[in-house]
């Protein structure tokens, strides 16, 4: 997150981190039920660990943290390169969470976000637009949902109904490492960090997010059948 601020501890209890090896954070994720996470399909890896209830970027133990393994990764069947439509993936964890003030699921929005809606994006991604400077703690940023027209004008031929744009204030954006993390509007999960331009946080190059209102049925059906 570029030019965000430290999240309040436990203010994003649905925020998850996907880790490679001992502690290499490579994507964000969102807790949507006691045993299921959502992340971006482009975050798929064969082996990873899941960390919930953690505020710091570092591996130092925190009392609210809970660690899990992913036992099933189910990317949306429509995700493909190079268009990046349908950029979402369900992850089933090896056990259910212990519900606490640090770890709680978030409800997915059934209605699509409208232009001007204020939302919160969060993550441990890089805080510099073109270099890997990672934050000490989880970062939060208020962003505004942009019109479909403005979104398509920013990225001609690259936007479809499975995406929405938000942000667009120069110097503020999600960035590398935030992928798969939550965009929460009015207390409900509206999107996932999907993609954007490089360097991050450029004028007229807003962040592009997976439009989760289009996938409520697929998410419910997939969880029920697995």
């Amino acid at each position: 997150i570029v030019n965000g601020s430290d999240c309040q501890k436990d203010a994003q209890p649905w925020q998850g981190a996907l880790l490679l090896g001992p502690n290499k954070l490579y994507c964000g994720a969102v807790l949507i039920s006691p045993q299921w996470l959502l992340t971006a399909a482009h975050c798929r890896k064969p082996v990873f660990r899941i960390r919930l209830g953690h505020h710091s970027m570092s591996p130092v133990y925190e009392s609210g943290q809970q660690m899990f393994q992913g036992i099933k990764s189910i990317p949306h069947p429509g995700y493909s390169h190079p268009g990046h439509s349908n950029d979402l993936m369900l992850i089933k964890m090896n056990r259910k969470i212990r519900d606490s003030h640090s770890v709680k699921p978030v409800e997915i929005a059934c209605d699509c976000a409208t232009e001007g809606t204020r939302c919160m994006v969060s993550g441990w991604g890089t805080t510099s637009s073109s270099h890997n400077n990672f934050p000490k703690v989880l970062q939060c940023l208020n962003i505004t949902v942009l019109s479909e027209e403005r979104c398509k004008n920013s990225y001609p031929g690259q936007i479809d109904k499975t995406m929405f744009c938000a942000g667009d204030e120069e110097g503020r954006d999600s960035c590398q490492g935030d992928s798969g993390g939550p965009v929460v509007c009015n207390g409900k999960l509206q999107g996932l960090v999907s993609w954007g331009d490089f360097p991050c946080a450029q004028r007229n190059r807003p962040g592009v997010y997976t439009n989760l209102c289009e996938f409520v049925k697929w998410i419910k059906d997939t969880m029920n059948s697995n």
């Epitope: 390169h81 960035c175 992928s179 993609w195």
Partner: antibody, heavy 127, light 108 residues
Framework: QLQLQESGPGLVKPSETLSLTCTVS??????????WVWIRQPPGKGLEWIGS???????YYNPSLKSRVTISVDTSKNQFSLKLSSVTAADTAVYYC???????????????????WGQGTTVTVSS | DIQMTQSPSSLSASVGDRVTITCRAS??????LNWYQQKPGKAPKLLIY???SLQSGVPSRFSGSGSGTDFTLTISSLQPEDFATYYC??????????FGGGTKVEIK
């Protein structure tokens, strides 16, 4: 300002291994989220991608050369290297190292363009 | 492999002319296309990335457009220093990264 410099022998015998090194100055090879790329250009011809290595030290090779190519990185020396085995006259070319700059973040991160290049080094394969 | 076809392979133009070079991909590459300029004996130089974004320091007379399979590089008013060979390049998630065959812009 980032600069790249290729080094290695200008003449290699057929069936031997071509070894080149690219030294990165003006920036760290490990601190930035970039790809490090080898490209070659046979005399009077177009550009051919050989392979790339990323910040995870994952390697990506041109399938037409994959069985003969190794790319590695040495962060302590701020260098990355190319080895091409069993060379023939068809491997005679100018070899360039370059930095691959991602075209975006997230789902767009694995797509890149080469924004900084070395000046190139000529390698001739001949006995 | 995705094939990149550039046309024309060469062209003659005068200073001040508007020059257009096209690049066609054998399948959709979204906006993942870059353009380079190469002068004799020199390394290529990135001009345009992501089909239409101008690389820092490149004159505004260069512009790029297109998405999917068809792309265009335009030089709005050719300058003496623009006589060179131009290459398009697609950057795939799956290798190989491939270049077009090049377009040589010569003085008429």
């Amino acid at each position: 300002q980032l600069q790249l410099q290729e080094s290695g022998p200008g003449l290699v015998k057929p069936s031997e291994t071509l070894s080149l090194t690219c030294t990165v100055s003006g920036g760290s090879i490990s601190s930035d989220d970039y790809y490090w790329v080898w490209i070659r250009q046979p005399p009077g011809k177009g550009l051919e991608w050989i392979g790339s290595i990323d910040y995870f030290a994952s390697t990506y090779y041109n399938p037409s050369l994959k069985s003969r190519v190794t790319i590695s990185v040495d962060t302590s020396k701020n260098q990355f290297s190319l080895k091409l085995s069993s060379v023939t006259a068809a491997d005679t070319a100018v070899y360039y190292c370059a930095r691959g700059r991602p075209l975006g973040y997230g789902a767009r991160h694995d797509y890149y363009g080469m924004d900084v290049w070395g000046q190139g080094t000529t390698v001739t394969v001949s006995s | 492999d995705i094939q990149m076809t550039q046309s024309p392979s060469s062209l003659s133009a005068s200073v001040g002319d508007r020059v257009t070079i096209t690049c066609r991909a054998s399948q959709s590459i979204s906006s993942y296309l870059n353009w380079y300029q190469q002068k004799p004996g020199k390394a290529p130089k990135l001009l345009i990335y992501s089909a239409s974004s101008l690389q820092s320091g490149v004159p505004s007379r260069f512009s790029g457009s297109g998405s999917g399979t068809d792309f265009t590089l335009t030089i709005s008013s050719l300058q003496p220093e623009d006589f060179a060979t131009y290459y398009c390049q697609q950057s795939p998630y799956f290798p190989p990264l491939t270049f077009g065959g090049g377009t040589k812009v010569e003085i008429k």
